[in-house]
Structures are given as C-alpha cells and as structure tokens.
Amino acid sequence: MMTGTIETTGNISAEKGGSIILQCHLSSTTAQVTQVNWEQQDQLLAICNADLGWHISPSFKDRVAPGPGLGLTLQSLTVNDTGEYFCIYHTYPDGTYTGRIFLEVLESSVAEHGARFQIP
C-alpha cells in the first residue's frame, strides 16, 4: 500500500530571464527512493539515480542545473518554459509517486502591466 505523499515547491510565476528552483519532497513512507525523474509535458529534463547520480538531457544541459538536493534549477527562463513540470519518484517497494508544479514565465511587459503583487 502506498502511504507516501509528495510535497512540492508549489506553483511559481517568474519573469523571463530569471531562474527558479523546482523541488519535491516525499514524506510519510519508509520506501527507498531509487530514482527521481524530472519531466515537462512528455519531455525528460533530468534524472537523479540513487546509484548513478545525475543525468541532464542534452537539450537542457545549458539551462538546467541539478539540485539543490533532488530538486532542479532552471536558468535563463523563456516564455516557452511555461508549463507543467513533474517530479516522478521511483521507490521500492511502494512504486511511483508523482508531484506536479506549474511554472508561468511572464514577458516583462505582461509582468509590469498585469495584476501585480505588492512587495511587503
């Protein structure tokens, strides 16, 4: 029986050109994490394997950095990075847990003229 839960960084709205960290955390289970995959839509961005370490997909190598921890850092954001990202935890003996994070990357013109958050 799968008892674990995935906690994520939560959805993120960022400006073009910036960088963000995507993170997930698996809790409430004693299952062993064997591998974590990071995907966007149907594209594999990166893999962190418990034995083999990190592998970043060649097409993302220049803009994606491993970590912190099992997370992923996305740099030099473009509006095309807008989309849903999945952290897929492969565990034994539980099986697979998936977390979802939506990243919205805004053109600076949209960020300036749209609904703005007041800075405390």
């Epitope: 959805n11 993120i12 839509q41 509006v79 807008t82 849903e84 949209v110």
Partner: antibody, heavy 117, light 112 residues
C-alpha cells in the same frame, strides 16, 4: 478592452461530443494562459484544465482527463475545449478564463451545455 | 488535491453591514518563494465571475476599496466594510498555489 467571447448554448445527445470556442480580443493572446472552469447546478466551480497558447502545453485536472481536450488556434486568437462521450453529468455552464499569476482576471460569458436524449 | 473550505455557506446581511467570509485550505498556500496564490471572486446571477482580490490582499483594477483580503498560510478572510446592493451574489475563493487549482464551495451573500 479584454474580452473573451464564447460560443452559444448547446443541446446534445448522450454519447456525443461537442466543442466550445472562446475567442480572445483586446490583449496579446499568446502572453497569457487560458483556463476552463465548469459550474454545475449553478454553484460548484471546478477547474478543468489550462492551455498555454504560446507553446500548446496543457495541464488537466485528473478528474477531467479523457473527458476534456484543450486546443488553441493562434491565428484566430481562439481557445477550444472539446468534451467527449457526454452524459447528463456533463450538463453545466462552462467558462473560459484568462489567468495571470494563478488568478483568473477575465472570464468569458459562459456556455450552457445540456445533455439530454 | 488541496481542499478549500469556505464559511459560512450563506450570509444574510442588511445594506451598510460589515461582513467577513472565511476560506481555509487543507495545506499551506505559500509556495517556496513565500508567494501565496489565493484569490477571491464575486459571481452575480446571469453574469460571469469577476476577480476581486488576488495574492491574498491585492484589489483588482476597478474593485472598490470596501473590499479587502487578509490572511496567510491556510487561513484567509474577505471583508466587505459596507455592503451595497451590487455586492449581493456568490463569493468564491480560489487557491492557485498547488495543482490542480481548487475553489471554495462558495458563500451566498443575500439580503436578510
């Protein structure tokens, strides 16, 4: 002025499929995410999913996966939602809504769908 | 999914009253950068829902200053300082921090 103009009311038979359109005007269509929301029984609001007009990416509420398919036509600034294998449970008002920073700032006028034999 | 609970379900008022609507979530709505995507909407009969407040406390353009939002973490409040006839309708909160976004069940603001 931002406007989202939806297609008109529909009466369809169970088992059929139908497509609702949402034509955007007054802003840069590719600069904002488009969401779809279901309102049942004149009360409950449920998020169906979203589409990113710029790259065609989608995100769905698991509850509506296989029920709704979201697409866009950038040339006409129009978003579409196709609803499949309709049943009486799908009878509702459906809204398209633009979002920015995960709040829905502009909404279409709603499309009433009635599924009945 | 994050469960969003709104209270009360119904709120009978007299014009000129000050009222509060509560919205509670099953987990914190602050993301890892400390931003909270919690918004409030008014849905009047025969109209589309309209955005009132975004990011907990920011009034959307054209929204009167009698509307205010507050809260943090899992507990949020919408206040109307002086209820006017045009404020009657269904109020909804929406959390956009976690996938999928989820709405509260709604609060009906109606005349006593």
């Amino acid at each position: 002025e931002v406007q989202l103009q939806q297609s008109g009311p529909e009466l369809v038979k169970p088992g059929a499929s139908m497509k609702i359109s949402c034509k955007a005007s007054g802003y840069s269509f590719t600069g904002y995410i488009m969401n779809w929301v279901k309102q049942s029984h004149g009360k409950n609001l449920e998020w169906i999913g979203l589409i990113v007009p710029n790259n065609g990416g989608t995100s769905y509420n698991q509850k509506f996966k296989g029920k709704a398919t979201l697409t866009v036509d950038k040339s006409s600034n129009t978003a579409y939602m196709e609803l499949l294998s309709l049943t009486s449970e799908d009878s509702a008002v459906y809204y398209c809504a633009r979002s920015l920073r995960f709040s829905f700032d502009y909404w279409g006028q709603g499309t009433t769908l009635t599924v009945s034999s | 999914d994050v469960v969003v609970t709104q209270t009360p379900l119904s709120l009978p008022v007299s014009f000129g009253d000050q009222v509060s609507i509560s919205c509670r979530s099953s987990q914190s709505l602050a993301n890892s950068y400390g931003t909270t995507y919690l918004s409030w909407y008014l849905h009047k009969p025969g109209q589309s829902p309209q955005l009132l407040i975004y990011g907990i406390s920011n009034r959307f353009s054209g929204v009167p200053d009698r509307f205010s939002g507050s809260g943090s973490g899992t507990d949020f409040t919408l206040k109307i300082s002086t209820v006017k006839p045009e404020d009657l309708g269904m109020y909804y909160c929406l959390q956009g921090t976690h996938q999928p976004p989820t709405f509260g069940g709604g609060t009906k603001l109606e005349i006593k």
